[in-house]
């Protein structure tokens, strides 16, 4: 599932490049392992912002699929309460390219620990 999430992220990146969306998004660029589920939640919430701002059907479908995949991969630990983690709004705001790069990085963290 996580490998498919990465391919969806690359698809979103390709779609966005042709659209010139210049939104800034809350981005966790240095994820601590004990906060990775919280960080994933922030990434997914921000991804929905991209979908809404783009108004593009392909981006919408890909984001929705990515959320479904992530949900299923995290169904066992998605409700784990992680303490001492930053709220989404406390994270740095970065451009979409940097946001997606950081997103791929956190997904790789999940791949490495699964």
């Amino acid at each position: 599932n996580w490998v498919n999430v990465i391919s969806d992220l690359k698809k979103i990146e390709d779609l966005i490049q042709s659209m010139h969306i210049d939104a800034t998004l809350y981005t966790e660029s240095d994820v601590h392992p004990s906060c990775k589920v919280t960080a994933m939640k922030c990434f997914l919430l921000e991804l929905q912002v991209i979908s809404l701002e783009s108004g593009d059907a392909s981006i919408h479908d890909t984001v929705e699929n990515l959320i479904i995949l992530a949900n299923n991969s995290l169904s066992s630990n998605g409700n784990v309460t992680e303490s001492g983690c930053k709220e989404c709004e406390e994270l740095e705001e970065k451009n979409i390219k940097e946001f997606l790069q950081s997103f791929v990085h956190i997904v790789q963290m999940f791949i490495n620990t699964s």
Epitope: L45, A57, I67, S75
Partner: antibody, heavy 122, light 112 residues
Amino acid sequence: EVRLMASGGGLVQPGGSLRLSCAASEFTFSNYAMSWVRQAPGKGLEWVSTISRGGDYTYYPDSVKGRFTISRDNSKNTLYLQMNSLRAEDTAVYYCARRVSMITGGWAMDYWGQGTLVTVSS
Amino acid sequence: DVVMTQSPLSLPVTLGQPASISCRSSQSIVDITGNTYLEWYQQRPGQSPRLLIYKVFNRFSGVPDRFSGSGSGTDFTLKISRVEAEDVGVYYCFQDSFVPYTFGQGTKLEIK
């Protein structure tokens, strides 16, 4: 008023194939994900499949995965369910349903068609 | 897979009286983004299912306000404040937080 009309049901032998259709009208079909849900005679509801708005993403339970294929033709406002290698336990009324977006709404099936009966028997 | 268990399976109610149906999931159905995709559907005799409640407590358009949904995590409830004759049918809870999406077995509401 949203309209969904399922058709294509009938009697088929075990191991046979059938293609169901669902004609949609009175809404912008391409703006919605769609699902199939079935109900065996006298039994409860079972989710069968969901397809994304553009048709790129499809989802199935293990009970039909590899045998059933959901697809759509947005130019014809039509949803399909191709059913292969049919078994007696696939006998059911099949309903098509419109899905509200996960991102903009509640991810629920807000409108349902009237259903078409599929009977698998020799 | 998430198993949805409803109770009771049969619910005889006097007209004008309240009714309550419970639905319990085998694991939490709160998704990673914090949403709980739990719906309630009504199926009247001989009819297609109809959406009543989505995301636990949101009433769908046109649904009478005597229907209400509540709950969180793994325990959910559908309440009908005053049962009317047209409420007869089978009620299903449904989770679509995690694939495969799953229905409860259904609760048959009948008039005493």
